[in-house]
Interface confidence: low
């Protein structure tokens, strides 16, 4: 459950625009070394389930939490903007750091430069003994619902239970699911948008609705851009993730809300409970469901999922397995692109996007999902580039 490395060695990072490698000591040093300057705009990240703000230190060649001392909302907005959130900023607070960090990035308030990174310096002390926890968007929360909604082997969902769930239509037909991550951006699967379904004008997104039948009477949201992962492999389904940008931003409400993108350092447990949702078939070779269904599925460790009795080496680091090896509950045709979410620290996280499987709910053939943690860096880059 970690970032997948680039083609460069451990001491280097790859320039997306040119494919060349630069030394990690040149990364976030205030000087652009990549043709498009991307080595200077990937310098901030949120870490772990507490959203701890970390900044990359080119001196130490490592990530460090930002000390709460002298932090204010202007810096918070700048950090969110640098991550790719347009004008979005939700909350920033100091929290006690339980990670055992011994070095921090601190603000030099006397530095006149507006650039937040030029104001930060490396320090082994943090007088407030608190680090910055930063939320760029109010994500991963849902209406209070008591009933556990459960796809094959699932139950009908309640309105507002999965407020980030999107139904993606082509020609009035539900083709794939998706997940809201910002007012403008939806995560889905790359295999959903393979040619000939790669043109944004073909797609319409529906949100905040449980029934497919009622979508006929609603105006869906036009899609402005479709961005498929550049390394998606249609044969192996490796890197099966895509983004859709909506023509006009969504208005969030009780039944339309974003899910949180996972942060590095999430530390998911083997067999951690996750939930899948979608309008896919409720039995193998069945018809698309009219009503949204959801079900709990446990994560399956990659090593276990890759054994010869299950998927025999087909699972890459960009994939996650989840489900019951005895069958009974699984995602199915029509659920593709939809969310695999988990609850951690009272926040719902998008852990996977529904990708593939052998049949539906078959024994020893669990569902396979795109490992979203691997793709967060790519997602933020697309959001930043669009801005």
């Amino acid at each position: 459950w970690k970032f997948m490395g680039s083609k460069c060695s451990d001491s280097g990072i790859e320039c997306d625009s040119s494919g060349t490698c630069i030394s990690s000591s040149n990364w976030c040093d205030g000087v652009s070394h990549c043709p498009n300057g991307e080595d200077e705009n990937r310098c901030v990240r949120l870490y772990g389930p507490n959203f701890i703000l970390q900044v990359y230190s080119s001196q130490r060649k490592s990530w460090h939490p930002v000390c709460r001392d002298d932090w204010n909302e202007n810096y918070a907005r700048a950090a969110c903007r640098d991550m790719g959130y347009k004008n979005s900023f939700y909350s920033s607070q100091g929290i006690v750091d339980n990670s055992g960090a011994t070095s921090f990035m601190k603000l030099n308030t006397s530095a006149g430069n507006v650039d937040i990174y030029k104001k930060l310096y490396h320090s082994d002390a943090c007088s407030s003994k608190a680090v910055v926890s930063l939320r760029c968007i109010a994500c991963g929360v849902r209406s209070n619902l008591n009933r556990q909604s459960r796809i094959v082997g699932g139950q009908n969902a309640l309105l507002g239970a999965w407020p980030w769930q999107v139904s993606l239509h082509v020609q009035n037909i539900h083709v794939c699911g998706g997940s809201i991550i910002t007012p403008e951006w939806i995560v889905t699967a790359a295999h959903c948008v393979e040619k000939p379904l790669n043109s944004p004008w073909q797609w319409t997104a529906f949100v905040g609705t449980l029934r497919q039948s009622s979508m006929f009477y609603e105006k869906g949201h036009r899609v402005e851009k479709v961005i498929s992962h550049p390394n998606y492999d249609s044969k192996t389904k490796n890197n099966d993730i895509a983004l859709m940008k909506l023509h006009t931003p969504l208005t969030f409400n009780e039944v339309v809300k974003p899910v949180c993108l996972p942060n590095p350092g999430m530390m998911l447990e083997p067999e951690q409970h996750c939930w899948i949702s979608g309008w896919g078939a409720t039995q193998e070779k069945g018809k698309t469901s009219d009503v949204l269904n959801a079900a709990m599925v446990p994560l399956i460790e990659p090593r276990r999922c890759n054994n010869k009795y299950i998927y025999d080496g087909l699972i890459t680091p960009a994939m996650i397995c989840a489900g019951f090896l005895r069958g009974t509950v699984d995602s199915c045709q029509g659920d593709s692109g939809g969310p695999l979410v988990t609850l951690k620290n009272d926040v719902w996280w998008l852990i996977g996007d529904t990708s593939w499987g052998s049949g539906c709910a078959q024994a020893n053939r669990p569902g396979v999902y795109g490992n979203v943690t691997v793709f967060t860096d790519w997602i933020y880059r697309q959001m930043r580039a669009d801005d």
């Epitope: 082509v170 020609q171 959903c192 040619k195 000939p196 004008w201 319409t204 006929f216 036009r222």
Partner: antibody, heavy 117, light 112 residues
């Protein structure tokens, strides 16, 4: 039953514009894409463009981008195609056709456009 | 752009004979996610608008006589009429919808 009604013929002068209509009935107009197709005398079929009546989303064949403009009037369930700067080359039969998934399941009878002075 | 080529451009057969016509695309029309070929066949009788015969390369539209059969995958497709009737006199067009929409030049079927 599904019907796409088009006027039989239009006669216009070179340099002028014309707005061709296609009135839909027998189905929910706003839930299906509408296409326009051209057929010159004795020639084959050429796809012009597509519009979604609900959202107004359009997409055009590059060849017709500066020639055709697609619109709809939801209240009358009518699709329109405006053709501008007409020349004799634009004389043809113009069909509207409903898209179901990715094929055209219903066609209008076509409007014969004659551009002549 | 995807180019669609039909052959022959015309053919004349007697009623009751079997007819095959070909349609080739400049790139594959098979979508791996749906496992469908995005190709349709249309029939246009003299003085009439086109009529859908076959979609997804081999699925016959409801109401179309079963003497019409579509086959093929990828880039090579065939429309077969098992026993031609006088009312089949028409031009037959193939159309791709894999990337926007392109029609083939048509095959004109005449009855001897």
């Amino acid at each position: 039953q599904v019907q796409l009604q088009q006027p039989g013929a239009e006669l216009v002068k070179p340099g002028a514009s014309v707005k061709l209509s296609c009135k839909a009935s027998g189905y929910s107009f706003t839930t299906y894409w509408m296409h326009w197709v051209r057929q010159r005398p004795g020639q084959g079929l050429e796809w012009i463009g597509i519009i979604h009546p609900n959202s107004g989303t359009t997409n055009y064949n590059e060849k017709f981008k500066s020639k055709a403009s697609l619109t709809v009037d939801k209240s009358s369930s009518t699709a329109y195609m405006q053709l501008s700067s007409l020349t004799s080359e634009d004389s043809a039969v113009y069909y509207c056709a409903r898209l179901l998934w990715d094929y055209f399941d219903y066609w209008g009878q076509g409007t014969t456009l004659t551009v002549s002075s | 752009d995807i180019v669609m080529s039909q052959s022959p451009s015309s053919l004349a057969v007697s009623a009751g004979e079997k007819v095959t016509m070909s349609c080739k695309s400049s790139q594959s029309l098979l979508n791996s996610r749906t496992r469908k070929n995005f190709l349709a066949w249309y029939q246009q009788k003299p003085g009439q608008s086109p009529k859908l015969l076959i979609y997804w390369a081999s699925t016959r539209e409801s109401g179309v006589p079963d003497r019409f059969t579509g086959s093929g995958s990828g880039t090579d497709f065939t429309l077969t009429i098992s026993s031609v009737q006088a009312e089949d006199l028409a031009v037959y067009y193939c159309k791709q919808s894999y990337n926007l929409y392109t029609f083939g030049g048509g095959t004109k079927l005449e009855i001897k």
